[in-house]
Structures are given as C-alpha cells and as structure tokens.
Interface confidence: medium
C-alpha cells in the first residue's frame, strides 16, 4: 500500500504564439480546480477505462479575476498536493490523465458551472520510494507543469511496496537472515510471509503463502514473462516453460467484484462495474465522495444530497454510468430520419443522407414540392435531387418572384421596336417588315413572303407575340 | 496538440506505420483525420477514425491504409506502399459543433502536425 | 463524387490590396465549408469554418462568403505574411459520397 502524491507547480500560458486568453473575466470570476486519474502500467488502454489505481480531485483555487487587456498569467492554484492511496502494489508504471477544471462562479442558475479547460496524459515509469519527479506537459496553448512521486505506506517499503517492515526487536541488529529496512535503517523486514520461491521483484503477497503477480509476469512464483507471441494450441508447450498462457479458470470465476459488482473478462483480466458508492478494482472501496474522483471521461462530480448517494456523477455527451465509465451508443437512438446513416464522430453525431435528404438529421425532402410554392402561376417541377419552378410567362428566378423582362433578349427582328405586354411581348415592326418577331419582309406589291398576315392586321402594324 | 512520426525512406511494397500522438485531449472524444501532401501538390483526405474506434476512408484509400488508434495514439498503415505514395502525411484532429440546429455542422481539421515525409523508392 | 473546384490557381496582389479566391463545390454542401493558410514547409492553418466563421486568432482582414455551392475567400489590406497556398475543403456528411472531406486543388496568393 502507499499513496501517489502530484504536486501543481504552475498552470498558464505556454511559451509558443497564440496566448490563450484568460479562462475567467470581471464579469464572469472563476477559480481553478484538477483531477488526477491514475491507471496501472504502460498498456494501451482505452482513455474511457477506469481510473484503476485511483483518482483524486484538488480543493478548489483561489478566486480569480482577469485583468482587462491583460495577457493570461500563471492562474492561482489551489493548496495542497493531489493524492491517490494505492492498496495493491505499486505497479512501477504507470498511466496519468490530469485535467484542469475551472468553476465559474458568475450568477449561474443551479449553481456553479465547470468546463474543462486542458487535459494532459502520459504514460512513466516509476518507482515507489524515490525522489520528486519533475514534468511539463503542454494541451493546445496552455502549459501545465508539475512534480510526482509514489511513497509506501508504513509497514510497505520496496520499489513496489511489497516488502513489509517492522520496528527492530533489538537495538542494534535485525534477527537472523533479515535486512534492514532502507531507507527507515531503525526498522527491519518482516519474516517472509509469501510462497516460498515467490520473485522478490515481480511477486507480491498480501496473505500468508500467496503469491501475486505484478503486470506482465506470470507462473505460480511470478517468474515467468507473460509471452506477447500466441501460443501454439492449447496442447502446446507447457506455460511453465513459454510464459504462455493457457486456458484455465476464468478470471471472473467466483465473482472477485465485491459489494454486489459485476465481473466482465477483458484481455488482460478482468473488469468490475460497480455500484454507486463502491469502487476500485474489486468494487471493494465505499464511502466514495467526491474527493475521491469517481467520475471517469471528464464527468462531473455533485454531492449526493443523502448518504446512500455520496456523489452523482453529470457525464459529458457520450457517456453514461454511475461514474460515466460506459460509452453510450447513441447511433442506437437511431436519430436519422429517412434512411440516413448515423455516424458518431466522438465531439458530434452526423447523419449521412440518401438522395433526396439533406439536414442534420435528413430530415429535409429536397424533391418535395409541398410548401415550395411557386409565385406567380408558376408550378412545382420534382426531381434531380431539388425542386424547380417552372414559371408562367412574365416571370423567372427560382421561385418565380422575379418578374422577367421580355425584351431583354432583343427579340424583334430587322429593326422593330419591343413593347413588354402584360401577356408578353409586342413587336412595332420598321416599315417593310411585318410578323410577330418582324421576321418577314413585305413584297412590293403589298403580299407578305410566307405566312399571310392576319385578316385586319395591316403590315407595319404592332404584332403581338403570344 | 498533435505530431506525427515514423516517415522514412522505404522501398515498393515494404508496408509502413505511421503514427500520431496526441496530448492536451482524449482520443476517445475527437474523430482524428489523416491528410497527405505529394511534393508540390495540394492535400489531399484519406480517412478519419471516429471517437469510438470506427475508420472511414477516402473510396480510393480504401485497402491501400489502415487506420487504427490506441487511447493516445493513432496509427496509419500503409500497406503496400507505391512511388506515388511518397508525401508528407498529416494528423489532424476534427472540430465541429455538438449538436447543429441547422445544416451548418461547422466540421474542421484543427489542430494540424508538422507533418511526417514518406518517401516511397526503390 | 464531390469535388472541390478552385479558382484562380494562382493570384498576385500588391501589398495592401485585395484578392479573392473562388471555390466550387459540385453539389450543395450547405454553408459546411472549411478555409485553410498553408505556407512552404509548414503545416496548414485553420483560417475560416461554417463558411464564414473567422478562427480565433485569425485577422479580420480574412472573410469568408458564399453558400449552397459557391463559397469565395476574401483577403484584403494584403500583407507579405499573407503570401501562402489557400486551400477550400467541404466539410458536408450528409451526402452519398466517395471522399468525405475533399479539399480544392489550392490557391497560391502572390504578395508584391
């Protein structure tokens, strides 16, 4: 057993261009709080996992209140370190999520409001007992520096804190066979309590006679490397030998969870979802608050308003669970109308659309025709993907409304002159010419070239273009 | 922020990793893109990998990459790579509003890597 | 497929004045349209999202228009740091195509 403690030195502006600005204004003062999340070895876990060595959450910052026209400077940081108990065996590595949270704290209805304002996460190698280690990460134009260490906790000492130590029982030496306890030199290691054989380095026991693997060793004394290559059958070698793993008892025979948790088997192990108020890797943790940070993938933590619910975990979109540890399938609520296929980008959901639809759900027909009247007795035209108007003479544009100029096209032939005709058009044809466009020239002797003009239109008079 | 790494100088068909590591947000929450630049052209998409771990390509990408990611990685592999391959290969994370009241989704690749060069010769 | 046509492929202005880059979408991408600054050897830079939606940090003097199909990039009071390839890409989902994110064919701007 022992405790992670992180110490925030500074959070602020990083030193490349683009000064983020001040997360809090005159108007809207806020104060800054973080959230460590811890999680065993350097395996590629999901970044929705659960916080397997633990979590914790800082007190909250001083107030503060940005300068105006004032550049973002270090924000005042809350007191104190950050510390994560650890009950098993400090693993040696180690992933880190650690979030900075502001609380605004402006005239909000229901109470404070918090954002996230940067998120760094790293994976380290680390051992328990050694001295500060010094960081600086950076998320987007913020830049968080900060110190951590893993210490073990009395009577733990060790690189995993797995040896046990004891006051001595005699002033000057420690009984026969045992070391002194570096670096508390007054104390001295307990009797071997482990299997016999157990690896000193890759072992652990917590019972009398056990003996417990730390990640990535296996075999009934921890000495043998888990292979990363598959076995050959299950008949194949022996795990003895290999470091194989063959197939035994399942790692959620007998329910390890505790407290009413459900197992369910991962690659590795296994994983337990637990009840409201219980957490840790067996669920065997209670009287959760939300100092203990339970609420995983940037959820939020309210205090319970009775003890049977210490803390109520407000998740962001995508997330669901007592502590917002269960990615929600929201394509399942099927939000796309008209066939369209839903797709979850993680920040957004989007539609894609059949032919036809279009919007953020499809839900728009674009080849319907009702309530997309045309102005001016034009009619509706379906197909290619989008309604058209056909327009009645006189009239244009997409909806009809444009009123058309018919004689912009200069339709009037061999020098006539365009009227514009409530109907249409009408042609005064130049002496010598005649039809509706001016098209026909006028014989001499009074008879019009193809066709003959209209009884009681004399040539020369306004033609009518109907 | 994001950076790519693992371009090299690599010969016709030797498959090739490429990998992008994020830090400041969670892959779990950003859709991540993959862009390529040929010397002297412009960019061009060959796929993203949503929040969930789903990837989508570009019709003519598809089979010639493979987009995977890790909780603070992505990777691209290029499977069997050709002459005209050889690019610089971008990561980018994708923005856009969560919910869209209208049609304006307002999606965008920010922020970009400084890139990674490939060069595919024999 | 969607394609992403730009106009001109190259432009030159002198300091203090103003260009204007045309993009073409092939079908309707509904305002989702995405502008970005690329300088030689650099990575590409968001300018301008949702088609007209300045990125902070970006100087007003970038503007962005357009809808439906046709989107233009507007860049006045032109200064030397301008000089860059500027690219279009559609950012529209709903639609049955083969290349989600297209971007155009690239914008030099020339700064005299």
């Known amino acids: 057993a022992g405790v992670f403690e992180l110490q925030i030195h500074s959070f602020g502006p990083g030193p490349g261009p683009g000064a983020p600005r001040s997360p809090c204004s005159a108007r809207l003062p806020c104060r800054l709080f973080f959230r460590v999340c811890l999680k065993p070895g350097l395996s590629e876990e999901a970044a929705e996992s659960p916080c397997a060595l633990g979590a914790a959450l800082s007190a909250r910052g001083p107030v503060y209140t940005e300068q105006p026209g004032a550049p973002a400077p270090d924000l005042p940081l809350p007191d104190g370190l950050l510390q994560v108990p650890f009950r098993d065996a400090w693993p040696g590595t180690f992933s880190f999520i650690i979030e900075t949270w502001r609380e605004e704290l402006g005239d909000q209805i229901g109470g404070p409001a918090w954002s996230l304002l940067a998120r760094v996460a790293g994976r380290r190698r680390l051992a328990a007992g050694g001295p500060w280690a010094r960081d600086i990460q950076r998320a987007g134009a913020w830049e968080l520096r900060f110190s951590y260490r893993a210490r073990c906790e009395p009577p733990a000492v060790g690189t995993a804190c797995t040896r046990l130590c004891r006051p001595r029982s005699a002033p000057s030496r420690c009984g026969p066979g045992l070391r002194p306890c570096a670096p508390l030199e007054d104390e001295c290691e307990a009797p071997l309590v482990c299997r016999a054989g157990c690896s000193p380095e890759h072992g652990f026991c917590e019972q009398p006679g056990e003996c417990r693997c730390l990640e990535g060793w296996t075999g009934p004394l921890c000495t043998v490397p888990v292979s990363t290559s598959s076995c050959l059958s299950p008949r194949g070698p022996s795990s003895a030998t290999t470091g194989c793993l063959v197939p035994g008892p399942g790692p959620c025979d007998g329910n390890p969870c505790a407290n009413g948790g459900s197992c369910s088997e991962t690659p590795r192990s296994f994983e337990c979802t637990c009840p409201r108020g219980f957490y840790g890797l067996r669920c065997e943790v209670s009287g959760v608050t939300c100092a203990d940070g339970p609420c995983f993938n940037g959820g939020l933590c309210v205090g319970g308003a009775d003890p049977d619910s210490a803390y109520i975990c407000h998740c962001p979109p995508g997330f669901q669970g007592s502590n917002c540890e269960k990615r929600v399938d929201r394509c399942s609520l099927q939000p796309c109308r008209n066939g369209g296929l839903c797709l979850d980008l993680g920040h957004a959901l989007r539609c894609r659309c059949r032919a036809g639809f279009a919007g953020p759900r499809c839900e728009h027909d674009l080849d319907d025709c009702a309530g997309r009247a045309c102005a001016n007795g034009g009619t509706c035209v379906e197909g290619g993907g989008a309604h058209r108007c056909s327009c009645a003479l006189g009239f244009g544009g997409r909806d009809c409304r444009e009123r058309a100029d018919p004689c912009a096209a200069r339709p009037c032939a061999h020098g006539g002159r365009c009227y514009a005709h409530f109907s249409g058009l009408v042609c005064a044809c130049a002496p010598g010419y005649m039809g509706a466009r001016c098209e026909f020239p006028v014989h001499p002797d009074g008879a019009s070239a193809l066709p003959a003009a209209p009884p009681g239109l004399r040539p020369g008079d306004p033609q009518r273009y109907l | 922020s994001v950076e790519e790494s693992g371009g090299r100088l690599v010969t016709p068909g030797t498959p090739l990793t490429l990998t992008c590591t994020v830090s400041g947000f969670s892959l779990s929450r950003y859709a991540m893109s993959w862009v390529r630049q040929a010397p002297g052209k412009g960019l061009e998409w060959i796929g993203i990998i949503t929040g969930g771990g789903d990837p989508y390509y570009a019709s003519w990408a598809k089979g010639r990459f493979t987009i995977s990611k890790t909780s603070t990685t992505m990777d691209l592999k290029i499977t069997s790579p050709t002459t005209e391959d050889t690019a610089t290969y971008f990561c980018a994370r994708m923005i856009g509003s969560e919910y869209a009241s209208s049609s304006e989704y307002y999606d965008a690749f920010d922020p970009w890597g400084p890139g990674t060069l490939v060069t595919v010769s024999s | 497929a969607l394609v992403m046509t730009q106009t001109p492929s190259s432009v030159s202005a002198a300091v203090g004045g103003t260009v204007t880059i045309n993009c073409q979408a092939s079908q309707n991408i509904y305002s989702n349209l995405a502008w970005y600054q690329q300088k030689p050897g650099q990575r590409p830079k968001l300018l301008i999202y949702g088609a007209s939606n300045l990125e902070s940090g970006v100087p007003s003097r970038f503007k962005g228009s357009g809808s439906g199909t046709e989107y233009t990039l507007t860049i006045s009071d032109l200064e030397c740091d301008d000089a860059a390839i500027y690219y279009c890409?559609?950012?529209?989902?709903?639609?049955?195509?083969?290349?989600?994110?297209?971007f155009g064919g690239g914008t030099e701007v020339v700064v005299k």
């Open positions: 890409q559609s950012a529209y989902y709903t639609t049955s195509v083969d290349v989600l994110y297209p």
